[in-house]
């Protein structure tokens, strides 16, 4: 899906009303400098490709975070101020019923999601120059 | 104006079903989760179940294996199929816009559901 | 399914300030919703993402959350404001939107 007609402002929003306190829920228990940021993104739309990415795509060690709170926050937001998004989701949505994990809290996805919160981070401030 | 249009309610005996609907105007309707919330003469609110655009589905533990809840994205709608249905089922049925599936920012009218002999 | 608890009912005279609180375990780790309910209505969001307004919802609506309680504060109480008031979150677990058992306010 390419992300660049997306409301940015409006996901932001989302991101700052309704999906950073889970993500900090998550990873309660967890020191901010236990993991370094390894994923990044230079511009907004290519922010959220990382962030689907991260946040639905099975990876070794974390197969489950796409069940979290806050993916099903972010799936919502990106339905709604993504053009077209709902419908590129239906078929991903049907093979992924096949291989439904049940959620299951590794070391793997809590690096996993310290990623995301960079990438939400890096989405929040476009403005910045790339590290 | 966005606006939600729920019917289908009325009187069945226990044991019976019902099919709710939903009409939904205004808004990008295949873009949203929806769901049906209740309300019991008197008492408070009750979420019911919940449906991504997708067909994801989630179902409060009290209509399990008895409420199907599902849309025609097509046609706009949004539907509550309860069978087997309890004298502790009647209440006042709300249509919803989940807004970023925690929070309701749109309801319906609302349509009462009588179950009774 | 995490419980909400919420006090029956909370009285205020006018232009008082009322507070109606939101217990549960945890609940600072969530975000918090309030609806308010008047007779024969459907009810309306007045705070969401824990202090956040709707537009139209008037600027005596406040509110906040942290450790396991939220609160919902009406400044300058009118008339107008009587009515139910749910708070909302949801379980982290079963994913399933919970409310509270709701206030009725009574401007006195």
């Known amino acids: 899906y390419d992300f660049t007609n997306c409301d940015f402002e409006k996901i932001k929003a989302a991101y700052l009303s309704t999906i950073s306190k889970d993500l900090i829920t998550y990873m309660s228990g967890t020191k901010s400098t236990e993991f370094n940021n390894t994923v990044s993104c230079s511009n907004r739309p290519h922010c959220l490709t990382e962030i689907q990415s991260l946040t639905f795509n099975p990876t070794a060690g974390c197969a489950s975070l796409a069940k979290e709170m806050f993916a099903m926050k972010t799936k919502a937001a990106l339905a709604i101020w993504c053009p077209g998004y709902s419908e590129t989701q239906i078929n991903a949505t049907q093979a992924m019923k096949k291989r439904r994990k049940r959620k299951v809290t590794t070391n793997k996805c809590l690096e996993q999601v310290s990623q995301l919160q960079g990438l939400w981070r890096r989405f929040n401030r476009p403005l910045l120059k790339q590290q | 104006q966005v606006q939600l249009v729920e019917s289908g309610g009325g009187l069945v005996q226990p044991g019976g079903s019902l099919r709710l609907s939903c009409a939904a105007s205004?808004?990008?309707?295949?873009?949203?989760?929806m769901s049906w919330v209740r309300q019991a003469p008197g008492k408070g609110l009750e979420w019911v179940s919940g449906?991504?655009?997708?067909?994801?589905?989630y179902y409060a533990d009290s209509v399990k294996g008895r409420f199907t809840i599902s849309r025609d994205n097509s046609k706009n709608t949004l539907y509550l199929q309860m069978n087997s249905l309890r004298a502790e089922d009647t209440a006042v049925y709300y249509c919803a816009r989940q807004q970023y599936f925690d929070h309701i920012d749109i309801w319906g009218q609302g349509t009462l559901v009588t179950v009774s002999s | 399914d995490i419980e909400l608890t919420q006090p029956p009912s909370v009285s205020v005279a006018p232009g008082q300030t009322a507070r109606i609180s939101c217990g549960g375990d945890?609940?600072?780790?969530?975000?918090v919703y309030w609806y308010q309910q008047k007779p024969g209505q459907a009810p309306v969001l007045v705070i969401y993402?824990?202090?956040k307004r709707p537009s139209g919802i008037p600027e005596r609506f406040s509110g906040s959350n942290s450790g396991n309680t939220a609160t919902l504060t009406i400044s300058g109480t009118q008339a107008e404001d009587e009515a139910d008031y749910y708070c909302?979150?949801?379980?982290?677990?079963?994913?399933?939107?919970?409310f509270g058992g709701g206030t009725k306010l009574t401007v006195l």
């Open positions: 993402g824990d202090s």
């Open positions: 945890s609940l600072g780790g969530k975000y």
């Open positions: 449906i991504f655009f997708d067909g994801t589905t």
């Open positions: 205004g808004f990008t309707f295949s873009s949203y989760y």
């Open positions: 909302q979150s949801y379980d982290l677990k079963s994913l399933n939107v919970v």
